[in-house]
């Protein structure tokens, strides 16, 4: 069961896995959740009754029964990992800790104007896990305004001490706020021969890359495939680092693959969720249980529902045996990866899906797209919403996109003349406008947040957020779309679609069925040539055919320009403005979402 509250003055006895240092019990709980085996923890707060060397210790614990005996102890705070919970989990920690010095390897020291600037520096430095900043009031003159960037093997401090007039905090890479490049390429027949920080077994290079991404010290990796000549190294995943942050040594070697940590793009790709099945593959590890199951899918469900199960191997039933049920071996290891991977024994293996909730919901695969045609089918664009106004009568006003369970991203110009959020209704999971009746459920709007630099669509900043009164429960027909990564600024999107219920020509009416059109992106230089009377800024993005014919139009405003990249859909643009609709040499102009990621995160993550 999911227990979220913390137990004050309580200590769990026994079950210790390891001890780390965290600045708060709340963060100790996050560290426990992300640890492959931790189910419970005990944190020691700062207290006069407690030995200062034990302050801020976070003891990670495991138990076969999923609980441990409780003992009363002043200053101890205990709790359970969120592994047992079904809600979305994030490692993002924006808290600033006053008068705490988080110890680590101080590898970079520089002057910064503020703690925020120091945190930004840490977020944009490939090695930085956390920082300590000496404020203006720091007693030692030569240390004032000094920003120390730090890292450790675990990503958590090696110790935490009280120190007046300093503040500490963590890198915001896991909050999607890093400007570091996101290099998704996997390089075949390549070995990176830099320092290894760890090695694990993985079934393929993609899993190896995901493990690298959530390993605190891994910057890039090399994976030896199952065809690697040296049998003892097949399926070996080497997690690597270097001083420069880039591989210094690339060696051509067949059957090896190498790539980079996806830390800077982890909010828009699955990192923890290894959802594939590996046929004719056996994962070895500590056996948790052996149960009968009808299929490998059923075995994966059993593993996902068993909180301690990390991976499994399913051996299909021999004909007519055991009512056609095979054996499902539920397994675990110290690091969450198989201790060995064997091929050719007929097993089907995979991982728990319990960790998928640590990834952004937007990375979930949606059903295959219908090619051709202009009308969409149900569930094809599950992030698309229709925004209605009820004044003076109810009608479709604009499109919008679900980007979080309480947030819709749309265009600012949609709210011209809208006096109050009370007159707005957001309908999700809708294909046809005719489905919307008096009793159709909708989301009320609590708040309209328009970019404060917005004046008119043509001059940019045409972006707005709607905070919903209630949260969206994600289903196949209503789920979020990923925001583009700041590290993906140089990606060339080739599979982009504009969707909406808008006009099909300049003088028309709102369409009943959600329409879709595949539209190529146009460079800003090319777009500027087509709109000489306007300034096409880098905060805008253009799309359209030279000959015209396909475009967004009236009523599509605020809706998404959705682009598929590496199997994940990204909200690249918001339908904003254009000269007419689908005119020759007049591309549509969209708000360039990647340029507003900071603004979106600032508004949606505000406490």
């Amino acid at each position: 069961e999911c227990v979220t509250q913390l137990l004050k003055d309580t200590c769990f006895e026994g079950g210790d896995i390891t001890t780390v240092f965290t600045p708060s019990a709340k963060y100790c709980q996050v560290v426990c959740t992300y640890h492959p085996r931790c189910l419970l923890f005990t944190f020691t707060a700062e207290s006069p009754s407690e030995d200062p060397t034990r302050w801020f210790t976070c003891v990670l614990k495991d138990s076969v029964t999923e609980t441990l005996p409780r003992v009363n102890r002043t200053a101890a705070i205990s709790g359970y990992s969120f592994k047992q919970c079904s809600h979305q989990i994030s490692a993002c920690n924006k808290d600033i800790y006053v008068d705490l010095d988080m110890k680590g390897i101080n590898y970079n020291s520089s002057v910064a104007k503020s703690a925020q600037e120091c945190q930004e520096r840490c977020t944009d430095d490939v090695h930085c896990h956390f920082f300590t900043y000496a404020t203006r009031q720091f007693p030692s003159l030569e240390h004032r305004n000094i920003c120390l960037l730090k890292h450790t093997q675990t990503g958590t401090p090696t110790r935490i001490t009280k120190l007046d007039k300093v503040v500490s905090g963590f890198s915001l890479k896991s909050c999607a706020l890093s400007n570091l490049a996101c290099i998704r390429d996997i390089f075949p027949n390549t070995v990176f021969a830099d320092s290894n920080i760890d090695s694990v077994m993985a079934p393929d290079a993609f899993v190896c890359g995901r493990i690298c991404t959530h390993h605190p010290g891994c910057l890039f990796f090399t994976f030896f495939s199952q065809e690697w000549p040296k049998e003892s190294q097949r399926n070996l995943c080497l997690l690597k680092t270097s001083e420069s942050g880039l591989p210094s040594t690339r060696i051509k070697k067949s059957k090896a693959l190498s790539g980079f940590s996806l830390q800077s793009c982890r909010h828009s790709i699955p990192v923890f969720c290894h959802s594939s099945f590996y046929h004719d593959t056996d994962f070895l590890g500590e056996e948790l249980d052996i149960v009968a199951a009808k299929s490998h899918e059923a075995c994966q469900k059993l593993c996902t529902n068993a909180v301690r199960c990390q991976f499994f191997t399913y051996t299909p039933a021999q004909a007519s045996c055991n009512e056609g049920k095979g054996k499902c071996y539920l397994k675990l290891s110290s690091n969450g990866s198989p201790t060995k991977i064997l091929h050719g024994r007929g097993g089907i293996s995979g991982y728990t899906l319990r960790l998928c909730k640590m990834d952004n919901e937007c990375t979930t695969k949606i059903k295959p797209r219908i090619v051709g045609g202009t009308a969409s089918v149900r569930g094809e664009w599950p992030w698309q919403v229709t925004l209605h106004t009820t004044s003076p009568t109810q009608r479709h006003l604009c499109g919008g996109s679900i980007i979080g369970n309480q947030w819709i991203l749309t265009a600012a110009h949609c709210f011209y003349g809208v006096e109050s959020p009370k007159i707005l209704r957001v309908y999700s999971g809708i294909l046809n406008q005719s489905e919307i009746k008096e009793d159709t459920s909708f989301f009320g709007v609590q708040e309209i947040i328009i970019h404060d630099q917005y004046k008119m669509a043509e001059s940019g900043y045409d972006i707005a957020l709607l905070k919903l009164e209630t949260t969206v429960n994600y289903t196949d027909s209503q789920r979020p779309i990923c925001l583009p990564s700041k590290g993906d600024r140089n990606v060339i999107y080739t599979d982009c679609w504009v969707t909406g219920w808008g006009y099909r020509k300049l003088r028309d009416k709102i369409q009943n069925t959600l329409q879709k059109a595949k539209i190529p992106l146009v460079t800003n230089e090319e777009c500027q040539k087509r709109y000489r009377g306007h300034k096409i800024t880098h905060k805008m993005i253009c799309a359209g055919y030279r000959e015209g014919g396909k475009d967004a139009c009236k009523g599509d405003s605020g809706g998404p320009l959705s682009c598929k990249h590496n199997e994940v859909w990204h909200l690249v643009g918001i339908t904003s403005w254009g000269e007419g609709c689908a005119q020759r040499e007049r591309p549509g102009v969209y708000t360039n979402v990647v340029e507003y990621v900071d603004w979106i995160l600032e508004k949606t993550q505000a406490v």
Epitope: N196, I197, S199, K230, Q233, L236, K240
Partner: nanobody
């Protein structure tokens, strides 16, 4: 028990030459990718040169044009010919088999299937 035994280290003057050898036993030498690493006092372990099982070679920028790696599969031996030696080449030189990168900057810890020799000291000094 896999064994890698280095020899040929010693004291040499700047500009001088040395030839290091590494004799391997208890594994299939010709199928292995071999390498020389070095570790100077207080420094991290660094890759000097690699020769793959199919004869492909790699050299660190700092030794390019001065060092030559070679192997004699019939003798299960790896060589490193070091010319124009400089004081900054002073280090313990380690022979390694199927070891793609050092672990934690240390020339002794390996991952599955990777092996290290015990090292031979090269001192370049006048």
């Amino acid at each position: 028990q896999v064994q890698l035994v280095e020899s040929g280290g010693g004291l040499v003057q700047p500009g001088g030459s040395l030839r290091l050898s590494c004799t391997a036993s208890e594994f299939t030498f010709d199928d292995s990718d071999m390498a020389w690493y070095r570790q100077a006092p207080g420094n991290e372990c660094e890759l000097v040169s690699t020769i793959t099982s199919d004869g492909g070679t790699y050299y660190a920028d700092s030794v390019k044009g001065r060092f030559t790696i070679s192997r004699d599969n019939s003798k299960n031996t790896l060589y490193l010919q070091m010319n124009s030696l400089k004081p900054e080449d002073t280090a313990v030189y380690y022979c390694a088999a199927d070891q793609w990168g050092s672990a934690e900057g240390d020339c002794t810890s390996s991952y599955p299937g990777g092996y290290w020799g015990q090292g031979t000291l090269v001192t370049v000094s006048s």
